[in-house]
């Protein structure tokens, strides 16, 4: 039994790091393998992660961690019974993938303005809370070419757009994802999308 693709890990910079790897053949990850991880710090104890299958030869492990700080560094040992298959290390702050924003809502109660709001996926005491920026993707269900991305680089998780910038009388969907420049993170996953009907009416012109 050998490791074909070494484990790569990303952290949500809160409580979970996810490591993925591939074996050289079909493997029952949960029964045959264990990933041990330990914070490089005096008196810290080793923890064991039981991996799950992720495709035929792929494995994935969700490592539970206490509040992460930028200096944290973990040793990783991948075991198959008594056999050490791979040894490595992981610094969560250097491999951050933020959590996906939630609660995306499109407020359409004003005819000429759309307000899109969502929730920051971190609690206020987490460092990333004040450092996330967002990409909002809006697309038409009727027209694949009507696809736009708004890069929201201010802190407030909201986006106001004039309803007239979208086509009237058709349905749109929106989703949002996050990243943090300070840690040069990857993008989060997209939030679940939300749908609305854009029914903007041109203002009546008086002659």
């Amino acid at each position: 039994m050998k490791v074909l693709q070494e484990p790569t890990c990303v952290s949500d910079y809160m409580s979970i790091s996810t490591c993925e790897w591939k074996m050289n053949g079909p493997t029952n990850c949960s029964t045959e393998l264990r990933l041990l991880y330990q914070l490089v710090f005096l008196l810290s104890e080793a923890h064991t992660c039981i991996p799950e299958n992720n495709g035929g030869a792929g494995c994935v492990c969700h490592l539970l961690m206490d509040d992460v700080v930028s200096a944290d560094n973990y040793t990783l040992d991948l075991w198959a019974g008594q056999q050490l298959l791979w040894k490595g290390s992981f610094k969560p702050s250097e491999h951050v993938k933020p959590r996906a924003p939630g609660n995306l809502t499109v407020h359409t109660n004003v005819s000429d303005t759309l307000l899109l709001t969502w929730s920051n996926p971190y609690p206020p005491d987490n460092y990333l809370y004040n450092h996330l920026t967002y990409a909002v993707n809006i697309w038409s269900e009727n027209d694949p070419a009507d696809f736009r991305i708004y890069n929201v680089t201010y802190l407030e998780p909201s986006l106001r757009i004039a309803a007239s910038t979208l086509k009237s009388g058709i349905s749109y969907r929106a989703r949002v994802r996050a990243w943090a420049q300070c840690y040069n993170t990857t993008w989060s996953e997209w939030s679940p999308s939300t749908k609305w009907h854009n029914s903007y009416r041109e203002p009546f012109e008086q002659h």
Epitope: V110, L115, Y154, E156
Partner: antibody
Framework: QVHLVESGGDVVQPGRSLRLSCAAS????????MHWVRQAPFKGLEWVAV????????YYADSVKGRFTITRDNSKNTVYLQMNSLRAEDTAIYYC???????????????WGQGTLVTVSS | DIQLTQSPSLLSASVGDRVTITCWAS??????FAWYQQKPGTVPKLLIY???TLDSGVPSRFSGSRSGTEFTLTISSLQPEDFATYYC?????????FGQGTKLEIK
């Protein structure tokens, strides 16, 4: 059209409290973050506080943190600034302003009220 | 906190002159940067946002630009109504600080 009207300014003694109000009209108040900015006599502008569209987050200048509280009532289209433990250096005209605009460039104060004067003096 | 240093604090110029006012940010900021004009006894008025976008109704003789952490407001040909105090503001992260202001006076 957008209209912001501040009220509540007064002459108060150091250590006392005061609450300013800013009544908004002409736009969907609950869609917009609101700010307070102040200007001491013959001085420049100083940003004081912001409250997000839904009241969920509030941020303050270091000079007022722990003494001032910004709140809003979206049902009344009003934003407030509760000022406690007032000092002489809080003497200023206080403006409320809308965090305005559309799209991703919507980070500026596009409409301002006329201001209300707060004088802290014994 | 991001500090803004605005220069000059006082600028004397004549009608028709081209003038520039500069703001330096203490650290790199995104494009959330605005300029305001204030005349004595009146409320500040938004001139430029997102570094270079003119607010509606602002004459085209006003322009804004950026080079790194240096932001510039340029008035291409001063008009009598332009004599006022100008403030820069960053809106990148809280607190949203202002520059100290530049008073533009008639020479």
């Amino acid at each position: 059209q957008v209209h912001l009207v501040e009220s509540g300014g007064d002459v108060v003694q150091p250590g006392r409290s005061l609450r300013l109000s800013c009544a908004a009209s002409g736009f969907t108040f609950s869609y917009y973050g609101m700010h307070w900015v102040r200007q001491a006599p013959f001085k420049g502008l100083e940003w004081v506080a912001v409250i997000w569209y839904d009241g969920s987050n509030k941020y303050y200048a270091d000079s007022v943190k722990g003494r001032f509280t910004i709140t809003r009532d979206n049902s009344k289209n009003t934003v407030y600034l509760q000022m406690n433990s007032l000092r002489a250096e809080d003497t200023a005209i206080y403006y409320c302003a809308r965090w305005g605009g559309f799209g991703v460039t919507g980070t500026h104060l596009d409409y301002w009220g006329q201001g209300t004067l707060v004088t802290v003096s014994s | 906190d991001i500090q803004l240093t605005q220069s000059p604090s006082l600028l004397s110029a004549s009608v028709g002159d081209r003038v520039t006012i500069t703001c330096w940010a203490s650290q790199d900021i995104a494009g959330h940067f605005a300029w305001y004009q204030q005349k004595p006894g009146t409320v500040p008025k938004l001139l430029i946002y997102a570094i270079s976008t003119l607010d509606s109704g602002v004459p085209s003789r006003f322009s804004g630009s950026r080079s790194g952490t240096e932001f510039t407001l340029t008035i291409s040909s001063l008009q009598p109504e332009d004599f006022a105090t100008y403030y820069c503001q960053h809106l990148n992260s809280y607190p949203y600080t202002f520059g100290q202001g530049t008073k533009l006076e008639i020479k």
